[in-house]
Amino acid sequence: QVVPPYGSENQTCRDQEKEYYEPRHRICCSRCPPGTYVSAKCSRSRDTVCATCAENSYNEHWNYLTICQLCRPCDPVMGLEEIAPCTSKRKTQCRCQPGMFCAAWALECTHCELLSDCPPGTEAELKDEVGKGNNHCVPCKAGHFQNTSSPSARCQPHTRCEDQGLVEAAPGTAQSDTTCRNPSESLPPEMSGTMLM
């Protein structure tokens, strides 16, 4: 098995992940593994020398960087919070704070904004990934209601009066629950029909 450094006349290396082409010497050299950087570049007679990233710095991939990249905190002013700390092999992992969504994306989220309220009679459509986009409000399905303006309130099923031994006084709507009454209670005058004899 050929180990770096080795000559390459066609500008390609055998292991595309762990080697890179050094065009001045026409050789393939080792990249440094995640968590390390190049402390001494390769030559025709000596392979790359790697060193571990210092605290508060990282390199995520096989690389031939001569520095490690500085860890950056999640910016709360931009609505971000930390879900995993920076390590020598991985940058700080951030997400939008609860009740916010990602409004600006450049390889990762850079700016979060407050989720829009959904008006009464609607709820936010459930997303695959929390914080990925703003709310898309959809009407409550039949037999359900939601009576607030809220970014997170869910439509609830209408109360079934009969389950409580009651009778329906007023049907539920998308914005209000069913109104129930005691069977013994008389209907208000405006609701009782006039009987003609």
Partner: nanobody
């Protein structure tokens, strides 16, 4: 995947100038070294110029003082300004980028430069 598209090649008289461009598109992000190579008719591909991610440039002896490599990181583009062209500069010119901070090496399709009277 990253795509590289070269442009600017053509027929030019000896002593003339051309400017080659190589624009990267697709999932192009990270830290890159950028190169221009050329392949004269019937010969092997050879390195012409280097632009490293650290801002250093380097040239083949045969083009020193005549060719200039530059890059516009905002436009994801690398250029090769070729002055005082000679018949022996006739070749297909290829741009090549190699990602420094992660695996990745990409080639353009090449652009033909012909120097002839």
């Amino acid at each position: 995947e990253v795509q590289l598209v070269e442009s600017g090649g053509g027929l030019v008289q000896p002593g003339g100038s051309l400017r080659l461009s190589c624009a990267a598109s697709g999932r192009f992000f990270g830290i890159y070294d950028m190169y221009w190579y050329r392949q004269p008719p019937g010969k092997q591909r050879e390195l012409v110029a280097i632009s490293t991610s650290g801002g250093h440039t380097n040239y083949a002896d045969s083009v020193k003082g005549r060719f200039t490599i530059s890059r516009d990181n905002a436009k994801n583009t690398v250029y090769l300004q070729m002055n005082s062209l000679r018949p022996e500069d006739t070749a297909v010119y290829y741009c090549n980028i190699q990602r420094v901070d992660a695996p990745g090496m990409y080639w353009g399709q090449g652009t033909l430069v012909t120097v002839s009277s």
